[in-house]
């Protein structure tokens, strides 16, 4: 009798030990994971995060679609709606250069760096060549008339525009439009001005920054968060809190991301900080990630979202701050009337697009999203989509703008910058992070389950045997 009872008790004890061990392993395992993650996401020499941060292992592509104007004469002569036809994608490989001037500052636990710019055309991923021609707004004419509203200056500009045979629209190659060309009208300006114009001029051989970000050594919750940009904590483009540099650069976020979080990040392309909210769970190459999207609320007018009041910087074009979906970034572009929006004026008010025909906004194609691995905070896949527009206004003094009867926010191009973790990197990530965590979770569950089952089973058997013996 004793042998059997002792065996049952031993089994119950082993079960209890296994269950306790499994239970203990949960917080301990979590602690181990947190400890490992905290160690590996710090931005310092020797960590996984640092290696991938210095030079992204992911191939990043920037696709461009150009809005080819179909009726330039009609617009110029009759102030008709602008008919556009998007042509693209024209694809470039970007962000392939390693960060430069990386300097650790142990005093405040930050690391500073420059992000060099470079673009390599990818013919196999494009619909044409860099020599393809497009009819687009004359960037110099539109910008000059906005920068110099003084009528006398405009009369002077008009004589130079006429002399150079420039017009409201121009034909330019893709290479010229994106990376720069010498403008014939600006070449005649008698005082010193930059005569080169381009949507992204200058780009190659330039760098974005200096960025100074927290390396996470003192507090992991601050890792990758920007401390200063170009030596300042503010941008000097906006009023109040709109001017703040918030969050990271969106390449990564502090670890242990929760679905309830609002992820703040700064984008120098749009000259502002913005935010993303959780949308859905996504499985990316076997890695569970959280998809965060830029909500329409971020592009709303101050009437719809009072938080955006300080992004409304002028009253006329914005119809007294009631228009939405476009952001005037002229202060950040040396006064050039550049407006940023989502492609095809997605989430924009009808008055913005009523002067343009041929646009088809579509959430799936035109919104921006970030797929973030929640444990590490790494962005494993993203699609950054934005449209660059230029404001052109009627001018009584500039002949080629004289017949316009209204303001136009003219779409020039839209871009889709994408990056997805490669298959090899994903495999490595699965084995090193997801795999290990899943294995640990599995071991915890097995120990706990087996332990509880053993304990319960042996205890029931023991109780049953005892009651038999007593009888």
């Amino acid at each position: 009798g004793c042998d059997r009872n002792c065996g049952l008790i031993t089994g119950a004890v082993i079960g209890a030990v296994l269950a306790v061990f499994g239970g203990i392993l949960m917080p301990v395992g979590d602690m181990l994971i947190q400890k490992t993650i905290k160690k590996e996401v710090v931005l310092e020499e020797g960590t996984i995060a640092f290696k991938n941060w210095v030079k992204t292992g992911t191939e990043i592509y920037r696709q461009f679609w150009i809005f080819d104007v179909q009726n330039p004469q009609e617009v110029m002569m009759n102030s008709s709606n602008i008919q556009v036809k998007q042509r693209g994608p024209y694809t470039y490989r970007v962000r392939f250069l390693a960060k430069e001037n990386i300097t650790q500052d142990p005093k405040d636990n930050t690391v500073s760096f420059l992000q060099p710019n470079g673009a390599i055309f990818e013919p196999s991923l494009s619909v044409g060549t860099e020599a393809d021609n497009f009819t687009v707004l004359n960037l110099a004419v539109a910008a000059a008339s906005h920068i110099y509203p003084n009528p006398f200056v405009q009369v002077v500009l008009n004589s130079l525009i006429n002399k150079s045979k420039s017009s409201m629209f121009q034909v330019r190659t893709l290479r010229e439009l994106l990376w720069g060309y010498t403008d014939p009208f600006l070449s005649l300006v008698p005082y010193p001005v930059s005569t080169r114009v381009g949507m992204f001029y200058p780009y190659n051989n330039t760098a974005d920054g200096v960025y100074k970000v927290f390396n996470g050594k003192d507090s992991i919750s601050k890792v990758a968060i920007i401390d200063t940009y170009k030596g300042k904590r503010n941008l000097s483009y906006w009023e109040s809190y709109c001017d703040m540099i918030n969050g990271t650069d969106a390449a990564s976020f502090p670890p242990f991301v929760e679905k309830s979080q609002v992820l703040q990040f700064f984008s120098s392309d749009i000259c502002r900080s913005i935010y993303a909210v959780f949308e859905s769970d996504v499985n990316l190459k076997g890695i569970p990630v959280y998809r965060f999207v830029l909500p329409s609320k971020a592009f709303a007018s101050p009437v719809q979202n009072p938080d955006n009041h300080c992004f409304c910087t002028e009253k006329i074009i914005s119809k007294n701050c009631t228009s939405y979906g476009v952001l005037d970034i002229s202060k950040c572009k040396e006064g050039k009337p550049v407006y940023i929006s989502l492609p095809h004026f997605l989430y924009a008010s009808p008055d913005v697009s009523e002067t343009i025909d041929g646009l088809n906004p579509n959430e799936e194609e035109h919104r921006t999203y970030l797929d973030i691995e929640p444990i590490t905070g790494f962005t494993l896949q993203f699609a950054k989509r934005l449209q660059v527009n230029l404001l052109v206004k009627p001018s009584n003094k500039i002949q080629v703008l004289k017949r316009l009867k209204r303001n136009y926010i003219v779409p020039i191009l839209w871009l889709n910058e994408t990056g997805t973790i490669g298959d090899e990197k994903a495999k490595m990530f699965r084995s090193q992070v997801t795999g290990k965590i899943n294995l640990l979770g599995l071991i915890e569950m097995i120990l706990l389950s087996v332990g509880v089952v053993m304990f319960v089973a042996f205890m029931i058997s023991y109780c049953a045997c005892r009651s038999k013996t007593i009888k």
Partner: antibody
């Protein structure tokens, strides 16, 4: 009150140069163009040129391109016109005129100096 | 260069009469015409600016019309204080050009 105060009359010899000043007050000098206009005795008005003080940009009537040079000193809110290689047909009243305005429509030459008489004589 | 032909060179009217001065330009200048009054011994004074806009403080008896190349300046009910030279100025293109002037006298 907007005022444009020009320097006094000048009597100069042929071939010489002269520099006329126009001191402004009552408005933001850099924001509005300053023009210079010539009026020969008993004749019509001729536009010499204009300068935009904000960036120093100038435009000249081709006829006066080699005759007049327009400059500004924004620290003293003063515009200047230098005339060189003077001849007898340069004898005239020279006016500075500002585009400072309020209200509708863009008005040219809204405020004028009192004029500076330049006499070229041997 | 846009040339401006102003007529008549001079005219003499009785007080209370209507005065009409005409300026014709050699190129189309839309409505970029301005009109000035110059009293003896004084600098010119802007009466009407581009777009036939009467300047603040200018009496409503002064008016103008025209578009393109043909412009007319009118004084209704002429007063003795209107004795002056009148000039038109085109401000459409460089160089700005004035008309030759019209001398108004009272009979």
């Amino acid at each position: 009150e907007v005022q444009l105060q020009q320097s006094g009359p000048e009597l100069v010899k042929p071939g010489a140069s002269v520099k006329i000043s126009c001191k402004t007050s009552g408005y933001t000098f850099t924001e509005y163009t300053m023009h210079w206009v010539k009026q020969s005795h008993g004749k019509s008005l001729e536009w010499i040129g204009g300068i935009y003080p904000y960036n120093g940009g100038t435009a000249y009537n081709q006829k006066f391109k080699n005759k007049a040079t327009l400059t500004v000193d924004i620290s003293s809110n003063t515009a200047y016109m230098a005339l060189r290689s003077l001849a007898s047909d340069d004898s005239a009243v020279y006016y500075c005129a500002s585009d400072y305005f309020y209200g509708d429509g863009y008005p040219w030459f809204t405020y004028w100096g009192q004029g500076t008489l330049v006499t070229v004589s041997a | 260069e846009t040339t401006v032909t102003q007529s008549p060179a001079s005219l003499s009217v009785a007080t209370g009469e209507k005065v009409t001065i005409r300026c014709i330009t050699s190129t189309d200048i839309d409505d970029d015409m301005n009109w000035y009054q110059q009293r003896p011994g004084e600098p010119p004074n802007l009466l009407i600016s581009e777009g036939n806009t009467l300047r603040p403080g200018v009496p409503s008896r002064f008016s103008s019309s025209g578009y393109g190349t043909d412009f007319v300046f009118t004084i209704e009910n002429t007063l003795s204080e209107d004795v002056a030279d009148y000039y038109c100025l085109q401000s459409d293109n460089l160089p700005f050009t004035f008309g030759s002037g019209t001398r108004l006298e009272i009979k």
